[in-house]
């Protein structure tokens, strides 16, 4: 028979034949042959693989480093990674929760709607038209654009949500 060029789901192609992938929680020890099945072995303690795979090494569980304010939210299994979270009152810097901050900052273009408390993180809001924020801050609100008119000046450059307007002198009409 013709050697296969593609295999079924949960199989992989090697040496012109289809072998079964190892199930989640197990790693590949040896590929299948004409006469033998794929050989897989369970991941060790503190290791995991979360997909059907042909990996020869399991991944290490994530370490929730207490020096970074991290603690274990959910212990890893042979099929799942450990999930970290931050100590009470602290907040993850990303979805992956690799480090902790006391509160998040609002990026340029956003202002602080509510300053963080012991129980809630900073609440940011986009700067509306007529307001801007050019800094990353955990306490500053959006600031209103400068009013050129009150300074007897004209707008030379329009403001954005991240920049103030630029004012300049009015053009004098020549006689």
């Amino acid at each position: 028979p013709e050697p296969p060029t593609a295999c079924r789901e949960k199989q992989y192609l090697i040496n012109s034949q289809c072998c079964s992938l190892c199930q989640p929680g197990q790693k590949l020890v040896s590929d299948c042959t004409e006469f033998t099945e794929t050989e897989c072995l369970p991941c060790g303690e503190s290791e995991f693989l979360d997909t059907w795979n042909r990996e020869t090494h399991c991944h290490q569980h994530k370490y929730c480093d207490p020096n970074l304010g991290l603690r274990v939210q959910q212990k890893g299994t042979s099929e799942t990674d450990t999930i970290c979270t931050c100590e009470e009152g602290w907040h993850c810097t990303s979805e992956a929760c690799e480090s902790c901050v006391l509160h998040r900052s609002c990026s340029p273009g956003f202002g602080v709607k509510q300053i963080a408390t012991g129980v809630s993180d900073t609440i940011c809001e986009p700067c509306p038209v007529g307001f801007f924020s050019n800094v990353s801050s955990a306490f500053e609100k959006c600031h209103p654009w400068t009013s050129c008119e009150t300074k007897d000046l004209v707008v030379q450059q329009a403001g954005t949500n991240k920049t103030d307007v630029v004012c300049g002198p009015q053009d004098r009409l020549r006689a």
Partner: nanobody, 116 residues
């Protein structure tokens, strides 16, 4: 490596004053928003005050408004907190922090005890 060293704490009577300092190194101090936070015995961290990089804008918790003043000297890489009209409830360890206020980026703190 970011280092923040707080000093100036001590024992003071109610109504008294103290000036806390925070010496910063390992980062460009003038580029960062800075915070003072405090932790009273058996309590969580409380945000006390903040100041923008230029020292032109400030924030104060309601509990310290009108009594505490935050300032900074960018030429000396130092943050200050002038505390007046101190009360028993101001007793806490005071910490300074740079924004973003990371868990691994804050100092040992300085203890302020307000008692008669």
């Amino acid at each position: 490596e970011v280092q923040l060293l707080e000093s100036g704490g001590g024992l003071v009577q109610p109504g008294g004053s103290l000036r806390l300092s925070c010496a910063a190194s390992g980062f460009t101090f003038r580029d960062y928003e800075m915070w003072w936070v405090r932790q009273a015995p058996g309590k969580g961290l409380e945000r006390v005050s903040a100041i923008n990089p230029q020292g032109t804008r400030t924030y104060y918790a309601d509990s310290v408004k009108g009594r505490f003043t935050i300032s900074r000297d960018n030429s000396k890489n130092t943050l200050y907190l002038q505390m007046n009209s101190l009360r028993a409830e101001d007793t806490a360890v005071y910490y300074c922090g740079k924004e973003p206020f990371r868990y691994d980026y804050w100092g040992q703190g300085t203890l302020v005890t307000v008692s008669s």
